[in-house]
């Protein structure tokens, strides 16, 4: 039988807005990944920032509802925004426990689906918060 969906929870310092209220944090101790049990969906998400071939996690947690993409078993990120020149935000949604822990692969930033220069921008050093 299914359990309530459990996702990895992480929010990088400086990230604006929190998704902590979308679930209940489990007490996992210090050495394990933080885990959140989703309150309103059976869907996890992840956001990574790719800069000069280096990916850094920005946010991981629960989505606020089940949307297209949530049926995916794995985290397959797609490019969503350019928060600053030379960096691209990739996001994924997936619907299995801890599926947002890491991604299967990142497509190249210039691949189809990347928003053009009209995408969300952020000043250098400023983080961006995206409504998923």
């Amino acid at each position: 039988p299914p359990n309530r969906r459990t996702c990895v929870f992480f929010e990088a310092p400086g990230v604006r807005g929190s998704t902590k209220t979308l679930g209940e944090l489990l007490d996992t101790g210090t050495e394990l990944p933080r885990a959140i049990r989703c309150l309103y969906s059976r869907c996890c998400f992840g956001i990574w920032n790719l800069t000069q071939d280096r990916a850094q996690v920005e946010m991981q947690g629960c989505r606020d509802s089940d949307e297209p993409g949530c049926e995916s078993l794995h985290c397959d990120p797609s490019p969503r925004a350019h928060p600053s020149p030379g960096s691209t935000l990739f996001t994924c949604s997936c619907g299995t426990d801890f599926c947002n822990a890491n991604y299967s692969h990142l497509p190249p930033p210039g691949s189809p689906g990347t928003p053009g220069s009209q995408g969300p921008q952020a000043a250098p050093g400023e983080s961006i918060w995206m409504a998923l």
Epitope: P1, R4, D97, F98
Partner: antibody
Framework: QVQLVQSGAEVKKPGASVKVSCKAS????????VSWVRQAPGQGLEWMGE????????NFNEKFKGRVTMTTDTSTSTAYMELRSLRSDDTAVYYC??????WGQGTLVTVSS | DVVMTQSPLSLPVTLGQPASISCRSS???????????LEWYLQRPGQSPRLLIY???NRFSGVPDRFIGSGSGTDFTLKISRVEAEDVGVYYC?????????FGAGTKLEIK
Amino acid sequence: QVQLVQSGAEVKKPGASVKVSCKASGYTFTDYWVSWVRQAPGQGLEWMGEIYPKNGVSNFNEKFKGRVTMTTDTSTSTAYMELRSLRSDDTAVYYCARQRDYWGQGTLVTVSS
Amino acid sequence: DVVMTQSPLSLPVTLGQPASISCRSSQSLEYGDGYTYLEWYLQRPGQSPRLLIYGVSNRFSGVPDRFIGSGSGTDFTLKISRVEAEDVGVYYCFQATHDPNTFGAGTKLEIK
């Protein structure tokens, strides 16, 4: 087919610890939570907690916090439940289950001085 | 903790006749994701519990279709359309919506 095979019966003294093992086969061990449930003699079932073998994240019944440790060894597809500071009312059959759908045969733990 | 109240505690049934077990929870078991984490188990004498129903009404694989789960919110029912000899044992309802997960006290089904 899915199978969960538990370790044999144990007799312990009050204050001691017990570690029950649960060896899984027939499925991908890291893809399912392992639940632990106990049943005192002639009584009903009591949920103790669960662990996700892929990363070791566990979720406990507060009643057992501080006394129970759940671990897994993914190389042998084995889950473990250790209960410390045993009391006579911990005498029970301890069951492991694959996310509550397939259950082990149970391990009787008797706590007696 | 969420209290699961089963009735009756003992259920004598004639072979071939229907049987019904009620389970009431002290809080709604519908979770924020829209799913109701309510399950039914049968523990035959001397055996481990066996999953019958999950998500209120979904039969687990291999469970005969004479077992029917229904209900919502705080009121749930397990019906057996025609009781067979192998159905003897203790039936437990269980909720996984709230922590800690909790079982009902059990309903002992026996043949008259």
